[in-house]
Interface confidence: medium
């Protein structure tokens, strides 16, 4: 069937439209286009004869129409009058006629709208505002946007005049927003610039800050007032009812008890004509004395002496407070407070008790803190540490050993080699060492105040070659998927290359394997049962290369989900039931059985002779590994038929 399609159907003024013909018959003589829904010679636009390829304009031809050989009609520079129906009249070669009608609509391109308002400065809770979208346009739809969102549902918002007018009743400060209107028709949509609604409000009840109402004599009083208001409020201060100044802030330096009283802030909005006030009562107290701490022992010895700290001066009916390290007192059996909290006693002091300590006196207004006091606890020396940690040195290098022991006052150090005193210094330096410098190096640390001394002995070997290495481990029985293991290749030596092998192969590339400490330490993160292998470390220098004995990692794992065998679940009455349970586990797990939830025996094998249908039910094997602390189980249903 012959049809006409209008592309587009809705056409903007000044644009073009194509009347596209579908299913045009074969063997045509020609065709004509007419304005309207019927063939009317007075309204012919154009005719076309196929044989001559001749187009002939008709009375309704405007010069904007173009006809195509496929009968389609293009109309350019569309005007409003072009709206309507168009009829195609087709004359076939057998002179039989056929007709089809199409149509389109013409709409104007909309201008950019603007918003007019009946009240530029509405007052909160009093005024209404009507926004109107200009200009008024026929066949246009009007939309409104608030802060780029569609209109909220509110009984105070009303659309009228075909949505062209938006009225806000009883405006509030929250209506202060960006308003836009939009006009739409089938061919265009335009938005206005935004209009900001300026709602006058306030002042609200002012707030006075800071909130504290108690001050000490000699302090500065600095009060600030603020009230929500549009336009911003004008402020006035009154003290005990007497006007002071018209400012937002009130400042009185070096106050005395006489400055106690009622302080009023008044906020005024000149546009709304409203006033609001807030009153605060300020109390000024006389200054109490600053406390200080006295001690009965200025140099206590660790683990021997007690110290009593006393907060001075003694004042009747006063609360005393204490702080250690800027924290309130911890609960400790070594800390004791006297009945009035004025004396703090530390029993058997340790080096961690140095403080600082502060005491405080509490009055009506605040807490007065003492200056901090630090205890000089005498301690140590602890066992000295000798660094570096190398035990092997090659001939010809310089030996530089340093000794350190935690001590107060700092320790005095002495060095001995093979029992013979060398020097009284913290560091020992020997240049260009030979194998004769091998021996026992002793560092002795002495605390002159406590009279204590401690020693550490280190064996130093001077040799160009290295010994056979050995592997030390930080965890001999790691748990699978939980623990990490660090293997360290001993000894630690200068100018040495450290190498590792696993099961005789060089280390595999794995994110769980990490070398550190100059390759001397091999760490396995999140060990798995597959890590239970032989680990060997090697050391290499210019004259020696050797491997350690293998260390096999014993990874604790499991128990995995057990397996009950045989897999059969159906038995004949009178048969023997012999179930075996197995679970991969290291060490081997403990086994137990339950039948229908009732505990049975703690064995790996469950045997029941000459079973009957009474033995039907669920058979559960439970496994537990005491080393990993993990459990597992499996349930099997057994059916016995008569």
């Amino acid at each position: 069937k012959l049809t006409i399609e209008s592309t587009p159907f809705n056409v903007a003024e000044g644009k073009e439209v194509l009347l596209l013909v579908h299913n045009l018959p074969q063997h045509l003589f020609g065709y004509s286009w007419y304005k309207g829904e019927r063939v009317d010679g007075n309204r012919q636009i154009i005719g076309y004869v196929i044989g001559t390829q001749q187009a002939t304009p008709g009375p309704a031809y405007s010069g904007r129409e173009i006809i195509y050989p496929n009968a389609s009609l293009l109309i350019q520079n569309i005007i409003q009058n072009d709206t309507g129906f168009y009829t195609l009249h087709v004359i076939k070669s057998d002179l039989v006629n056929e007709e089809a009608t199409g149509q389109f609509r013409v709409y104007p391109e909309l201008p950019k709208p603007s918003i007019s308002s009946n009240n530029s400065k509405p007052v909160e809770d009093k005024d209404a505002v009507a926004f109107t979208c200009e200009p008024e346009t026929q066949d246009a739809t009007y939309l409104w946007w608030v802060n780029n969102q569609s209109l909220p549902v509110s009984p105070r918002l009303q659309l009228s005049n075909g949505n062209r007018t938006l009225t806000l009743f009883n405006v509030t400060r929250n209506d202060t927003a960006s308003y836009k209107c939009e006009t739409q028709n089938p061919v265009s949509a335009r938005r206005s610039d935004s209009v900001i609604l300026n709602v006058l409000y306030g002042p609200d009840a002012p707030t006075i800050s800071p909130l504290n109402t108690s001050y000490r004599s000699g302090e500065n009083l600095n009060l600030s007032c603020h009230a929500a208001s549009n336009p911003p409020a004008q402020y006035s201060w009154f003290v005990n009812g007497t006007f002071q100044q018209s400012t937002q802030e009130l400042f009185i330096p070096n106050i005395t008890v006489n400055n106690s009283g009622s302080y009023t802030c008044q906020a005024h909005n000149s546009d709304t004509g409203l006033n609001r006030t807030t009153v605060t009562t300020i109390t000024v107290y006389a200054e109490p004395p600053k406390p200080f701490i006295t001690s009965n022992n200025s140099n206590p010895v660790e683990d021997e002496d007690a110290v009593a700290l006393t907060c001075e001066p003694e004042i009747q009916n006063t609360t005393y407070l204490w702080w250690v390290n800027n924290q309130s007192l911890p609960v400790s059996p070594r800390l004791q407070l006297s009945n009035d909290n004025r004396t703090l006693t530390l029993l058997s002091v340790t080096r961690n008790d140095v403080g600082p300590y502060e005491c405080g006196i509490q009055n009506e207004l605040s807490v007065d803190h003492s200056d901090p006091v630090i205890l000089n606890v005498l301690y140590g020396p602890d066992d000295p540490t000798i660094s570096p940690s190398y035990t092997y040195y090659r001939p010809g290098v310089n030996l530089s050993l340093s000794c350190h022991a935690a001590s107060n006052p700092p320790a005095q150090y002495s060095w001995l080699i093979d029992g013979n005193i060398q020097q009284h210094t913290q560091e020992l330096f020997i240049s260009n060492i030979t194998e004769k410098n091998s021996g026992l190096y002793t560092c002795q640390a002495n605390n002159s105040a406590s009279g204590h001394s401690r020693t550490t002995v280190k064996t130093i070997t001077v040799s160009a070659e290295l010994p056979k290495p050995s592997i030390s481990s930080n965890n001999s029985k790691p748990v699978e998927d939980k623990d990490a293991v660090a293997f360290t290749c001993e000894p630690e030596a200068q100018n040495t290359t450290y190498l590792w092998w696993v099961n005789g192969q060089s280390l595999p590339v794995s994110p769980r394997l990490q070398l550190s400490n100059g390759n001397r330490t091999l760490t396995l993160f999140n060990v798995t049962r597959n890590d239970a292998r032989a680990y060997v470390c090697g050391i290499q220098n210019s004259v020696s290369a050797n491997r350690s004995d293998p260390v096999t990692l014993d990874v604790l794992y499991g128990p995995d989900t057990p397996i009950i065998s045989p897999p059969d679940s159906s038995y004949l009455s009178g048969a023997n039931l012999n179930l075996s349970c197995h679970s991969a586990s290291n060490p081997s797990p403990q086994y137990s059985w339950r039948i229908n939830g009732i505990p049975q025996q703690h064995t790996q094998v469950l045997f029941i002779a000459k079973i009957t249908p009474n033995n039907n039910g669920t058979y559960a094997c439970f496994v537990s590994n005491l080393a990993t602390g993990r459990n597992n189980s499996i349930v099997k249903s057994i059916t016995v038929s008569a």
Epitope: E435, S438, S463, A464, E465, G538, S542, S544, A545
Partner: antibody, heavy 120, light 105 residues
């Protein structure tokens, strides 16, 4: 398979110089140290020193300082011993020797030796 | 560090037990032993005082400490005829003993 192949015998006049080679196969010389030793007729073994082919570090026995020079060509996997100002008492079999890091120890792989005869 | 071996030579029968001594002029933590057959390169026999090198028969053993070390062959075999050297690697220069020549009667 680890193997050290040394260059052939040399006969030189006193005061002359000579350069001996030691080609390694079965391992990369950069992974190890190369030692040189010598053994005079009916004499004990003498250690000349070592070279680290990776960085060129060397250590010489005091007796051979100025007499011996160690070099390597890592691309050819070869170590060289240069001997200068030769005297009749330098007549000896010169050995190259090393121990791979896979060990267990150094001095477990030896070249077949190069006889150097110093004679006028 | 001078190494002195004794004896300098010895002649023994197959099956005999043989001990070769090596004395160091100053203390060393380890001693090593090499075997050299006539016309051949030396071969590592024992390292770090008592460890057998790869492929060395168990009849060979080493012991000692400080300045005195020894190599023992528990039951001499014909193929053991060779010169045996001790070696120290603790201090530079590395040094060798004068050698002990072992002959089989």
């Amino acid at each position: 398979q680890v193997k050290l192949e040394q260059s052939g015998a040399e006969v030189v006049k006193p005061g002359a110089s000579v350069k001996l080679s030691c080609k390694a196969s079965g391992f990369n010389i950069k992974d190890s140290y190369m030692h040189w030793l010598r053994q005079g007729p009916g004499q004990r073994l003498e250690w000349i020193g070592w070279i680290d082919p990776e960085n060129g570090d060397t250590e010489y026995a005091p007796k051979f300082q100025g007499k011996a020079t160690f070099t390597t060509d890592t691309s050819a996997n070869t170590a060289y011993l240069g001997l200068s100002s030769l005297r009749p008492e330098d007549t000896a079999v010169y050995y190259c020797n090393e121990g791979t890091p896979t060990g267990p120890y150094y001095f477990d792989y030896w070249g077949q030796g190069t006889l150097v005869t110093v004679s006028s | 560090n001078v190494l002195t071996q004794s004896p300098s030579s010895m002649s023994v029968s197959v099956g005999d037990r043989v001990t070769i001594a090596c004395s160091a002029s100053s203390s060393v933590p380890y001693m090593h032993w090499l075997q050299q057959k006539p016309g051949k390169s030396p071969k590592l026999l024992i390292y770090l005082t008592s460890n057998l090198a790869s492929g060395v028969p168990s009849r060979f053993s080493g012991s000692g400490s400080g300045t005195d070390y020894s190599l023992t062959i528990s039951s001499v075999q014909p193929e053991d005829a060779a010169t045996y050297y001790c070696q120290q690697r603790s201090s530079y220069p590395l040094t060798f003993g004068g050698g002990t020549k072992l002959e089989i009667k």
